[in-house]
């Protein structure tokens, strides 16, 4: 425990001290006091440097003194023979004796008292920056007017921090400007403007005089500007060394003025103002800015419009323009958006046609649609060439964005029919000669494909079976062949309204309006063995004359068999109706006069016994198109006859073209349109 005073005596004092002794005393007085140690008696064996016996006084790491020998007071009024004054509150006294004493020595008597120290004067380092005040047991620092004592209780500074400037314009100066600024101060000024405005600082060279840098170039007093993560300065010296206009690019600025204890100058004065935060005029390719300005600042809004053929894609939505706002951080909103070339995407595929994979699907690219020739052609024109337009659509000069339509080429057989090995009444044929030929298996009959969805046949073929099974693409109707061919599934059968339905069809004598249409569930794919026949035109060019030749085909009865295995065909001339009337009906089911002959019927045959027969019904009587010799049209449909191998009667298709077209239009599907 610290004490204010005390006594220290050598061992056995006042008797002689023993040999070989080492003893120490730790003196401690309260904080803020020094120690006054004085000896009133000293009788210790004398030796050079007190090497044998000694009393040693140590303060910290410093030896304050080492004593031996005899001393007596010089002052008759004072008993003190030796004294020490230390400005510290701790002291150590160490007594040592060696192994022998030539005489009898009595040692020492000493006393210590706590004494006040003057911190203001007793030390090399002055404890206070300005005024030092001593008192018993301590000291305190004080400051001149307008200064305040810092938290360390030693340093004085001016109260120059804490000011926050929020006005859009202002002036700030160092304390006492233009008088010398206070030493040993740290002044912090804060400028806080509304977001979207940047602080711009302006100084004049002559308004700045701050203690210059040392030889190493370090400012002793300094002015620093801090804006976010950017720093301007430190600045010092005579005349402002930095830029006279500082654009901080921030709405918040901290000004820090740091001074040391020496070298005060007049200081500095600055002006600041808030500029709306500028946003850079960015180069956004393929676009136009509206309004166009030399400089854009906070809250400015521009509309960025893409040039034709370019679009801004955000998510999955494409737009031709977007708005961008100059934000408070000096950056444009929507800055990620860019005008990219319009992408028309992979072109849609078309039925029965193709489009080459484009090298590019971007604005300006060109693609070409083609139809699967020679079985399909482009119905709606336009040449099939499309370019990627500015609106993101593939556009054709004629059709616009409408896709081309590939429709079957009609009436063109892949191989022309030639009457080769002669068979009585007809020839073997290949389905490629008559690709429109449709086979009905129940009843055994024929039909003619007129487009992807429709089969034309005789009414008497379908009147008893409204769900006929049909096949296309096979020359042979053997089971193994039909299994490989295309089976057609009917959706609906349309019998001509003029066809009279009978309770006993076997006794029919009236075959007027013997025509029907079968709508298919699925479109037929055309190719070398499957292709439609054309319909007759409505002009007089399509009026048949006696002697005009037509082709018939089918799997009907031949001389040898009831049903042909392979397709048979014959070339027949048109004959006057009376020729058909004159032939005696082979197995009449009624009086010969009861059989009806009308202008809706064509009579043909009579040459070399070539004729259609049972099982050929519904097949086409195909005549060369008068306006296009490469094509055939269905002039007639095998209907009935008085006797096989003579003349036959065919439904005159030209008389039914309007009904055919109307029925097909009224019963088309959106897919077909």
């Amino acid at each position: 425990e610290p004490t204010m005073y005390g006594e220290i005596l050598s061992p056995n004092y006042p008797q002689a001290y023993p040999s070989e002794v080492e003893k120490s005393w730790d003196i401690e007085v309260p904080e803020g006091y020094g120690i006054h140690l004085y000896f009133t008696h000293l009788d210790i064996e004398l030796s050079e440097n007190c090497a044998y016996d000694s009393v040693q006084i140590i303060s910290g790491d410093t030896e304050e003194g080492r004593l031996c020998g005899q001393r007596s007071s010089n002052n008759p009024h004072s008993p003190i023979v030796e004294e020490f004054q230390v400005p510290y509150n701790k002291l150590q006294v160490i007594f040592k004796s060696d192994f022998s004493n030539e005489e009898r020595f009595t040692g020492f008597a000493a006393y210590y008292v706590a004494t006040d120290i003057n911190e203001c004067t007793d030390f090399v380092d002055v404890p206070c920056s300005h005024f030092c005040n001593n008192f018993i047991g301590g000291y305190f620092c004080s400051c001149p007017p307008e200064y305040f004592l810092h938290d360390d209780m030693k340093n004085c500074g001016v109260n120059c921090s804490g000011d926050v400037f929020t006005a859009l314009i202002g002036e700030i100066a160092s304390p006492n400007y233009p008088k010398p600024y206070p030493e040993n101060s740290r002044c912090e000024y804060q400028i806080r403007l509304e977001k979207g405005f940047q602080v711009v600082v302006t100084l004049r060279r002559e308004d700045f005089d701050v203690e210059a840098a040392d030889s190493a170039g370090n400012c002793l007093d300094s002015l620093v500007f801090v804006a976010g993560d950017r720093q301007f300065g430190p600045y010092c010296g005579h005349g402002f060394p930095g830029p006279l206009n500082i654009e901080t690019k921030s709405n918040a600025l901290d000004i820090i003025f740091q001074t040391d204890l020496t070298g005060q100058k007049k200081g500095w004065k600055l002006r600041y103002h808030g500029d709306p935060m500028p946003c850079p005029k960015e180069d956004t390719p393929n676009s136009v800015w509206e309004p166009a300005k030399a400089k854009y600042v906070f809250r400015d809004v521009v509309q960025i419009t893409c040039l034709d053929g370019f679009e801004v894609v955000e998510g999955r939505v494409g737009a031709t323009s977007f708005y961008s706002t100059c934000q408070s951080n000096g950056k444009w909103s929507n800055s990620k958006l860019k005008c990219q070339p319009v992408d028309c995407g992979i072109p849609e595929s078309i039925e029965n046609g193709k489009v080459e994979d484009p090298e590019s699907t971007l604005f300006g690219s060109v693609i070409r649609y083609t139809c699967e020739e020679p079985y399909y052609y482009m119905e709606n024109g336009g040449g099939g060439e499309y370019h990627c337009a500015g609106n993101g659509s593939w556009v054709n000069e004629v059709l616009g964005p409408e896709l081309p339509k590939c429709v079957p080429v009609c009436g063109v057989p892949r191989e022309p029919f030639e009457e080769k090995q002669r068979i009585i009444g007809g020839s073997d044929a290949d389905i490629k000669n008559f690709p429109w030929q449709v086979f009905f298996d129940n009843p055994w009959a024929g039909g003619a494909l007129i487009n992807e969805y429709w089969v034309l046949t005789a009414a008497h073929v379908v009147e008893g079976n409204r769900e006929p099974t049909m096949y296309v693409g096979s020359t042979s109707v053997q089971t193994s062949r039909l299994a490989k061919s295309k089976m057609l599934t009917p959706e609906h059968v349309f019998i001509h309204p003029g066809w009279k339905l009978l309770e006993v069809p076997e006794g029919r004598t009236n075959f007027d309006n013997d025509i029907a249409l079968v709508r298919l569930k699925d479109p037929v794919k055309m190719g070398p063995t499957v292709s439609p026949i054309c319909l007759p035109g409505t002009s007089s060019d399509y009026n048949l004359m006696d002697g005009d030749l037509g082709l018939i085909s089918g799997w009907g009865r031949t001389e040898k068999r009831d049903r042909a295995v392979r397709l048979k065909a014959a070339r027949l001339p048109v004959a006057p109706l009376r020729k058909c009337k004159e032939v005696k009906v082979e197995k009449p089911t009624a009086d010969a006069e009861a059989y009806v002959f009308t202008p809706n019927m064509i009579c043909a045959g009579g040459e070399k016994g070539m004729d259609s027969c049972k099982g050929d019904s519904g097949g086409a009587f195909a005549v060369q198109d008068p306006n296009d010799k490469t094509k055939f049209y269905a002039a007639g449909l095998v209907s009935w006859g008085p006797q096989c191998g003579t003349y036959g009667l065919y439904t005159r298709v030209k008389n039914y073209v309007d009904w055919i077209m109307k029925t097909m239009q009224e019963n088309s599907t959106p897919r077909e349109d």
Partner: antibody, heavy 119, light 107 residues
């Protein structure tokens, strides 16, 4: 009326060959597709092959490939089926059959020829 | 090759019973399937063609159904003349394979 008349029964030793004929009457062979079917005693029916006039090729069942040969003589309207490397399991009644039309598998069947393979 | 699997192999039934025989194809054969009846020592007789079409002259108690891979032959009321072996056959593509047969015998 179409008829198929087959050659008579045969007895053959293992490893030998047999050639069965089938004569068409009432029609021409060129108009028909001839198939061959066999049936071992107490066993099921096995399709052996046919001549496909459309493709102009003979199609053999995988099981008989390499051992069977089917030929036609259109001048006599006769079809032939030759089976070589005979083994006891080839003992069967062999039928020639004409292919039917429009879904009918077989139209006319021959009376069958019994081939017995025995050592 | 398309495999045809018939079930059951043997079926014991009485006169007047309703009998169903199943035929399964290893892949789709659409409707290209035929059913035959065969009696000992005789050539097979066609009953049904194109899966469901009845051959002319065949009694209406015989009927066929199915398409794709699953087919059935039904005899609505078994008659004494119907005890025989029945075969299915696919004619969709070569090889024209037969089922292994179903023997219908008197219970």
């Amino acid at each position: 009326q179409v008829q198929l008349v087959q050659s008579g029964a045969e007895v053959k030793k293992p490893g030998a060959s047999v050639k069965v004929s089938c004569k068409v009457s009432g029609d021409t062979l060129t108009e028909l597709s001839m198939h061959w079917v066999r049936q071992a005693p107490g066993k099921g029916l096995e399709w052996m092959g046919t001549f496909d006039p459309e493709e102009g090729e003979t199609i053999y069942a995988q099981k008989f490939q390499g051992r069977v040969t089917m030929t036609e003589d259109t001048s006599t309207d006769t079809a032939y089926m030759e089976l070589s490397s005979l083994r006891s399991e080839d003992t069967a009644v062999y039928y020639c059959v004409t292919e039917g039309l429009a879904g009918f598998p077989f139209d006319i069947w021959g009376q069958g020829t019994l081939v017995t393979v025995s050592s | 090759d398309i495999q045809m699997t018939q079930s059951p192999s043997t079926l014991s039934a009485s006169v007047g019973d309703r009998v169903t025989i199943t035929c399964r194809a290893s892949q789709s054969i659409s409707s290209w399937l035929a059913w035959y009846q065969q009696k000992p020592g005789k050539a097979p007789k066609l009953l049904i063609y194109k899966a469901s079409s009845l051959e002319s002259g065949v009694p209406s108690r015989f009927s066929g159904s199915g398409s794709g891979t699953e087919f059935t032959l039904t005899i609505s009321s078994l008659q004494p003349d119907d005890f025989a072996t029945y075969y299915c056959q696919q004619v969709n593509s070569y090889d024209w394979t037969f089922g292994q047969g179903t023997k219908v015998e008197i219970k």
